[in-house]
Amino acid sequence: TNQCTVRYNVADCSHLKLTHIPDDLPSNITVLNLTHNQLRRLPPTNFTRYSQLAILDAGFNSISKLEPELCQILPLLKVLNLQHNELSQISDQTFVFCTNLTELDLMSNSIHKIKSNPFKNQKNLIKLDLSHNGLSSTKLGTGVQLENLQELLLAKNKILALRSEELEFLGNSSLRKLDLSSNPLKEFSPGCFQTIGKLFALLLNNAQLNPHLTEKLCWELSNTSIQNLSLANNQLLATSESTFSGLKWTNLTQLDLSYNNLHDVGNGSFSYLPSLRYLSLEYNNIQRLSPRSFYGLSNLRYLSLKRAFTKQSVSLASHPNIDDFSFQWLKYLEYLNMDDNNIPSTKSNTFTGLVSLKYLSLSKTFTSLQTLTNETFVSLAHSPLLTLNLTKNHISKIANGTFSWLGQLRILDLGLNEIEQKLSGQEWRGLRNIFEIYLSYNKYLQLSTSSFALVPSLQRLMLRRVALKNVDISPSPFRPLRNLTILDLSNNNIANINEDLLEGLENLEILDFQHNNLARLWKRANPGGPVNFLKGLSHLHILNLESNGLDEIPVGVFKNLFELKSINLGLNNLNKLEPFIFDDQTSLRSLNLQKNLITSVEKDVFGPPFQNLNSLDMRFNPFDCTCESISWFVNWINQTHTNISELSTHYLCNTPHHYYGFPLKLFDTSSCKDSAPFEL
């Protein structure tokens, strides 16, 4: 018998070193995967049993010949994948019976030449992949054929020229995609694209196109249906007004010019592309943008300038420059990405004219933006900006009123900087619609009572690892944030807080408080008693208190937190938990108590929270394997549907001595049965 796996109507026989077709698969399979084997042929008679096949994938084998009768035997075959084989010849007969094929993949074979008309009968073919074959011509037949073809992939061949007579077989086709990437193209002969019925997308990445050849290409695309043109990874070192001029009689909407080592964007380079909506200039070497660089892009919606500019070298003169008003023509631009650049700073009119801009990403963009002032973003005053990403810019100070121009801003990301200051609250002045402020991973933030007084709309506040100080002031810095749903105060080594820290945050759903030092606050011996900072958080869903050194949980600290779905108390020093502390957590879905010092798991503590649990993590606790300590737990484990990962390996007895290292779940509770308190 074979080792194929069969699921529903799909048989997977891949990676089995097969040298012949299995003959004992179910006869009703519709998909057969034979990839990565040692097949040399696909004998038609071996497929007689599998006449329902719709998809046959025989990629990554050593097939050197295809018998025409295969498709006769498989009348319903729609997808035939023969990529990475050893086919060198395909004749008029090879696919003659494959009239119902919709997809044919012949990528990575050794088909150097297409003789006569092997695809003449493929009137249903919508995708044909002949990439990586050593073809020197695009000619796949004489006379019009492949009238339903939508994707023709000819990348990584040896095509030197595009000639009209070699593309006329596509005269009735509407190609959604023609991929000629990674071909050493040197010539676009007159009318070469006019012979194709319709061409919507052309990919010519990595095709060694220089500016002159690009200009010639664009003229040949004139008066075609082209909408998407990808010219990434060529050697388009400079563009001028003439480079794309041939595209003025098209409705081009997408243009990819990434990875071109583009240095000089000449004035008016895009002036003939009024329909363009998407432009990528990622990973280039642009020295300067001037006020006319983007002239004519009156409909552009998306512009990526990620790593588009010159990299900084020793000479300061090499800093790229964005002149004032460089973006002034882009009145419909909604998304601008300028990540990973070496721009010195913003100027007073850097972003002027971007009156539709909603998303602006400036991560690792600037070299001299240490201080944000109320002038930094003045050029965005007329932009309806919703999201601003300022991560990784070495920002150390935010001045009052910095964001006062951004009244519609919803998300502000200032994470991964070097901000060290006292937050007076005036930094956020004018952010009347703000939804999220991300400040995590900064140097030092000192809070005051008014730190967030001006942003009552805030729903998410992230303050992870910012060496947070003054958290214990009263009234609480968070008191104005009545709409807050997520608060992250983790990794701050917080040791002192007041009971009213979160008072009034009735909408809080997620509280991240892990990696702090709250142990003293929950001790019975704490002067003034334990600090119950969770009271009133009636809508709290997720609570993370991992790694806080906790060795006690006060009674009543989780009282009335009925909506809690997840509690993480892992990596603490908890040992004996008080009865009834989780009584209100009957809706709990996830409980993490891993790496504590828990020895016993008793019903009066864990009964309520275990009722509806999906996931429990109590690994690496020193369980005491006695009836009193764990019989209830073991019985529960053995009848629950809760997911308990690594139960066999990481739930081990620690005591008594003779049970040391013994898997908890194998503990025999039958001798405990007569102890009434431990019954299920």
Partner: nanobody
């Protein structure tokens, strides 16, 4: 990802007619081969009819001459019109599209022909 939803099944008298519909989301029918299959209790799933990008159609011998498969690309819908129905046409009818090298199936619609 293509989602297929069949409708139009139900109880029909022998000799009656029925029109099944299959709506696709995620990929228009104009770019794939679309078929109707059926599965009677305890039997394997069999082809009823199929329509190709070219408009070509194929039918199982058992329904030839009394069934028509058609499609409306604008509505992303393929239809199966069945006439002169027989008790042996009772089955769950499934819609099928093969696209991007994947075999997509609907949940099926029950057709019962009573004599």
């Amino acid at each position: 990802e293509v989602q297929l939803v069949e409708s139009g099944g139900g109880l029909v008298q022998a000799g009656g007619s029925l029109r099944l519909s299959c709506v696709a989301s995620g990929s228009p029918f104009s770019i794939g081969a679309t078929g109707w299959y059926r599965q009677a209790p305890g039997k394997q799933r069999d082809l009823v009819a199929e329509i190709y990008p070219s408009g070509d159609t194929i039918y199982a011998d058992s329904v030839k001459g009394r069934s028509t498969i058609s499609r409306d690309n604008a509505k992303n819908t393929v239809y199966l019109q069945m006439n002169s129905m027989k008790p042996e046409d009772t089955a769950v009818y499934f819609c099928n599209v093969v696209r991007w090298g994947v075999d997509y199936w609907g949940q099926g619609t029950q057709v019962t022909v009573s004599s």
